[in-house]
Each structure stands twice: as C-alpha cells, then as structure tokens.
C-alpha cells in the first residue's frame, strides 16, 4: 500500500494533518481484511482494494464496509461516510469518482466488520497515483551498422488516454525496458519525459521485447507496463550501405 499510515482515533487532535500511526495502538492479524492498494490513475478519481480471506474461511466477521473521511477546512469531518461505490472497481473495492476526489486534501479510510475497525490508512491522492499503461507502442528503424550486425531503432508510444497531459494536469515520466525474447532479465533505460526514445545497438538476428510504463513526475508510483512490443530486425547484408537506412 502506498501512502502514509494513520490512526483515525487521533484525527480530531490535529485536524489539518495526517497523523502517523503508533504501531502499539492496534494489531492486525493476517487473517483480518486488510487494505492492499489505493490507486488513482489520473489524479481525478481513485479506488481502494482490500483482501477478504476471512470470508472464504470458516470464521465469519460479518460484512466488510469501507468508510472514509476527508479533511474538511478547519476540521476533519467527525462523521465517517460509507463508500460511495462498491461496484465500479470490482470485488472488495471502493471507487471514488471525480466528485469525491481532490489532490488538495488528505483522506483517511477504514475497513470495518461488525462495527469494529480492522484496518485504516491515510493518504493524499498524489501519493497513490499510478497511471494506466502507455498505449500504441511502435518502432521504426533508425540505422544499421556497416557490419550489418547491429541496428538502432526509435520506439514511440502514447500517454494513457485518461491522463490529461495537454493541460499539464499530469506530467508523466516513462521507463522503457527491453530484452531479447529468450532472456529473462529486462534492460532498463533511464526515465524520460518524452514519448519516444532511441534504443541502440540491437542485434539484427534477434527478436526483442519492448515494454514501457509511466509514473507521475515527483510523486506516486509506476503503473503497469504496456503490452509488449515485439521487434524483429530483418537480416541485413553486411555490404549494404549505411546511408540506405536513414
């Protein structure tokens, strides 16, 4: 789970803050439901997910409910409100649409069962940003070495559709990884802010896999990788002039 932890019990003491949790205040058995992840794909909505192993076993804790509170100006709201939408983000989840979401206030959420709190977290939306995967990956050949053994390619992609890049609401940085198809370890390139990057010195007789993921610059975490782009470089005659491939 990404974001700072907090205990709701002491929120009223410092209404404009996110309190750090005191580890001694509560214990959480691994069998109890726990938050696994909260994620905002585009800074305008977010969802939170939890485990629910207990309900598949013999011990029934009763229905799991999520409650949330937002920092209201001058005070945290004293009332906790129940999840506005248990359906849209899938099983064991709560979805907060754009009406409920602002990057300018902290949130606290708690899971309850039979009236008791079993897990709680606090965070601001920017801490949980994980963009959707980049889309529309493609590549073009840039250059082939005089020997015909190596080639350089340019890989291009597009930002996820729901990321408001044009207005600057999201500034994404991208990480490209590539490897030969039969290898297990991915080579990582340095993060970049553009949606294209050259990849140098690939072997022409090999097939490569390329993938890209993104994160919001300065906050949040990397999102899921794009679909894999397969790059097959055609065998070139070692006598072919380099100029032919510009």
């Amino acid at each position: 789970f990404s974001g700072s932890e907090a205990t709701a019990a002491i929120l009223s003491r410092a209404p404009w803050s996110l309190q750090s949790v005191n580890p001694g205040l509560k214990t959480n058995s691994s069998k109890e439901p726990k938050f696994t992840k909260c994620r905002s794909p585009e800074r305008e909505t977010f969802s939170c997910h939890w485990t629910d192993e207990v309900h598949h076993g013999t011990k029934n804790l009763g229905p799991i409910q999520l409650f949330y509170t937002r920092r209201n100006t001058q005070e945290w709201t004293q009332e906790w409100k129940e999840c506005p939408d248990y359906v849209s983000a899938g099983e064991n989840s709560c979805y907060f649409n754009s009406s409920f979401t602002s990057i300018w206030i902290p949130y606290c959420i708690k899971l309850t069962s039979n009236g008791g709190t079993v897990d709680e977290k606090c965070f601001s939306v920017d801490e949980i940003v994980q963009p959707d995967p980049p889309i529309a990956l493609n590549w073009t050949l840039l250059n082939v070495s005089l020997t015909g053994i190596h080639a350089d390619i340019q890989v291009r992609w597009e930002a996820p559709r729901n990321a408001d890049i044009q207005k600057g609401w999201m500034v994404l940085e991208y990480e490209l990884q590539y490897k030969e198809v039969n290898e297990t370890k991915w080579k990582m390139m340095d993060p970049i802010l553009t949606t294209s990057v050259p990849v140098y010195s690939l072997k022409v007789d090999k097939e490569y896999e390329v993938r890209v993921r993104s994160k919001q610059r300065n906050s949040g975490n990397y999102g899921e990788f794009s679909e894999v782009l397969y790059v097959t470089l055609p065998q070139m005659s070692q006598f072919t002039c380099e100029e032919d491939f510009y």
């Epitope: 404009w16 309190q19 100006t73």
Partner: antibody, heavy 115, light 108 residues
Framework: EVQLVESGGGLVKPGGSLRLSCAAS????????MDWVRQAPGKGLEWVAE??????????YYAESVKGRFTISRDDSKNTLYLQMNSLKTEDTAVYYC??????WGQGTLVTVSS | EIVLTQSPGTLSLSPGERATLSCTAT???SSWYLHWYQQKPGQAPR???????NLASGIPDRFSGSGSGTDFTLTISRLEPEDFAVYYC?????????FGGGTKVEIK
Amino acid sequence: EVQLVESGGGLVKPGGSLRLSCAASGFTFSDAWMDWVRQAPGKGLEWVAEIRSKANYHATYYAESVKGRFTISRDDSKNTLYLQMNSLKTEDTAVYYCTLIRDYWGQGTLVTVSS
Amino acid sequence: EIVLTQSPGTLSLSPGERATLSCTATSSVSSWYLHWYQQKPGQAPRLLIYSTSNLASGIPDRFSGSGSGTDFTLTISRLEPEDFAVYYCHQYHRSTPTFGGGTKVEIK
C-alpha cells in the same frame, strides 16, 4: 490558539531575491500542510505554493506564475515556514500571507518589487 | 485552471438588507471544495463558509451558502455594520487552488 506571523518583506529591485518567514504556534506544525497566498495591492487573492507534512513526504506545489523562481520550505524544529523568492518581477509585488492550509491566516508581509 | 467569476463586483446595500453574492466556475466544482472568505480593509481574509454551506467556527448564522456544479451563492440575511467587506469564493477541486475576484459589499 493558532498564530501565524510573517516577516521578511520589504523593497527589492527586479531580478532580486527575498526570503519570507512565517513563525507558527498554537498547533502541531510538523503535522500541518502550509500554504502561501498573496494579494497584489487593491487586487484579489492568488494561491502561491503549498508544502505538506513529513508524513506526506514534504511534497511541494506551486502556481505556474512562480514555478522555478520561488521555493517553499519548512523547518519543523523551529516551527517556521519559508518562501524563497528569486528573480523577482514587478508583478510579484503583493502582501504575502502564510496560511494553515488556507484555514488560518497570518496578517501578511508586504513585498514591493520596484526599481 | 478553474476560473471563478464573482458577481456583482460591488453591492451597495443598507444595514438590515439581504445580500446575495454569486460565484460561477468555468467547470464543475464538487460542493465539498468550495469555500467563502471575508476580508476587511487592512486585515487578512477570514474563513466564513466551508464546503459550500457549512459555517466556520464563530461565524453568525445570518451567513449561509448554497449551490452546486458551477453556481454557488453566499447569502447574508440581514446585513450588520460589521459585514461590509470584500467576499471571496475559493475552490480546490480539480485544478490548482483558485479564488474569485471578490465582491465588495459597501454601505449604500
């Protein structure tokens, strides 16, 4: 009682620098999200910058008009908020208010940028 | 950036009268993130109403707020002498925090 007292304002030439301070008391400063808001003479309010608590990684945010020129920072051991203003322009002339996440406001300090 | 437009720019009224101040946003703002401030000459702004309709502590109940979407209203049911001031709306929903240009309520 929440108290916020700004200092460091004054007259500065265009292109110059100034550092504003805000001494905070009456609340747990280290837990607080703090903002600077300014008001040009006879004009409305303009949000300038925000810095969050350590629990929120001291994340900082800036208005486009000051990005790259102003830096918001804090010293939790001294209960003090800062605004370092570089490459000042005449349009930065304003009263600068220190605010507790725009809930509680100091009385402000006047910054005049003029040659 | 969400732009907030306040109207009228100036409202000339007598004590005891009702004042209605308008704030219009260029795109929808959830009511949770819309506040009103009062500012008197030479003073810092003071939070008046938070989340569209909730009175901040110490604010008399002659002040009230309403609205949703792009249109919000601050109402002062009966103006007292101390209410003559400038009023600002403020949002912090989808863009960077922004303030309206202000409405000055002056004595007629």
